[in-house]
């Protein structure tokens, strides 16, 4: 059941100052974990595990909780004030330019290169040329060209919202 709180229920120091464009003092901002009512007079609680709001707001609706995809693990559940935190499973990572999905980490570096960074939930293994020390980025090499290594363990969570 959604709880209902009014601006008057908030302690004076918590009460949000109404925005200038608003005419009524009751039409201010609602605290995290709530959204504003249709008439702007009340704050309505988000539903735990279903939706959330992270900041003081005048949102008509709370935001839908993210559901972790297959290939992801849930590090922390959605609460009324914080979205779900999902992380790629061990051996996979999420790139900045394709945040929708976790990709498999490479199992090793091309011949002539050495691994200097492990697979993490947010990065592939890192390879550098033995001689020059320059980083390698490109296609996954053919199997016979690889030096195998096991995926690294996660170091810290990678949060995705929405």
């Amino acid at each position: 059941e959604s709880a209902l709180i009014t601006q008057q229920d908030l302690a004076p120091q918590q009460r949000a100052a109404p925005q200038q464009k608003r005419s009524s003092p009751s039409e201010g901002l609602c605290p995290p974990g709530h959204h504003i009512s249709e008439d702007g007079r009340d704050c309505i609680s988000c539903k735990y595990g279903q939706d959330y709001s992270t900041h003081w707001n005048d949102l008509l609706f709370c935001l839908r909780c993210t559901r972790c995809d297959s290939g992801e693990v849930e590090l922390s559940p959605c609460t009324t004030t914080r979205n779900t935190v999902c992380q790629c499973e061990e051996g996979t990572f999420r790139e900045e330019d394709s945040p929708e999905m976790c990709r498999k980490c490479r199992t090793g570096c091309p011949r002539g290169m050495v691994k200097v960074g492990d697979c993490t939930p947010w990065s592939d293994i890192e390879c550098v040329h033995k001689e020059s020390g320059t980083k390698h980025s490109g296609e996954v090499p053919a199997v016979e060209e690889t030096v195998t290594s096991s995926p690294g363990t996660p170091a810290s969570p990678c949060s995705l919202s929405g």
Epitope: K21, E27, H35, I36, G40, Q50, D51, N57, D58, L59, L60, F61, C62, L63, R64, G162
Partner: nanobody
């Protein structure tokens, strides 16, 4: 990204009814709050109605309250606006929009996606 396409507009007599549809494609429709805006000839954009991601919460502008009903079918990726007791002042191009939420005044929260609009003429 979400693509939105409105349909269902047309010419109707005062007191008549129309049902607008907004078909969504692309990213998960059910993650988004949806809304209808309208723009009358020579006027600005007006926030008409909005609905949350699962259809449990709805908002209506005073000008349409009791006459318009917003709904959504997440299994069909479609938003609807049932318009009854239409008046001449409802004549406008109607746009659907998707966003994570909408603020009390209608401003989308986060990235917003818009349809091309469908014309409703009440005459």
């Amino acid at each position: 990204e979400v693509q939105l396409l409105e349909s269902g507009g047309g010419l109707v007599q005062p007191g008549g009814s129309l049902r607008l549809s907004c078909a969504a494609s692309g990213r998960a429709f059910s993650n988004y709050a949806m809304s209808w805006f309208r723009q009358a000839p020579g006027k600005g954009l007006e926030f008409v109605s909005a609905i949350n991601w699962n259809g449990e919460n709805r908002y209506y502008a005073d000008s349409v309250k009791g006459r318009f009903t917003i709904s959504r079918d997440n299994s069909k990726n479609t938003l609807y606006l049932q318009m009854n007791s239409l008046r001449a002042e409802d004549t406008a191009v109607y746009y659907c929009a998707a966003a994570l939420s909408f603020r009390l005044g209608g401003e989308p929260y986060g990235d917003a996606y818009w349809g091309q609009g469908t014309l409703v003429t009440v005459s």
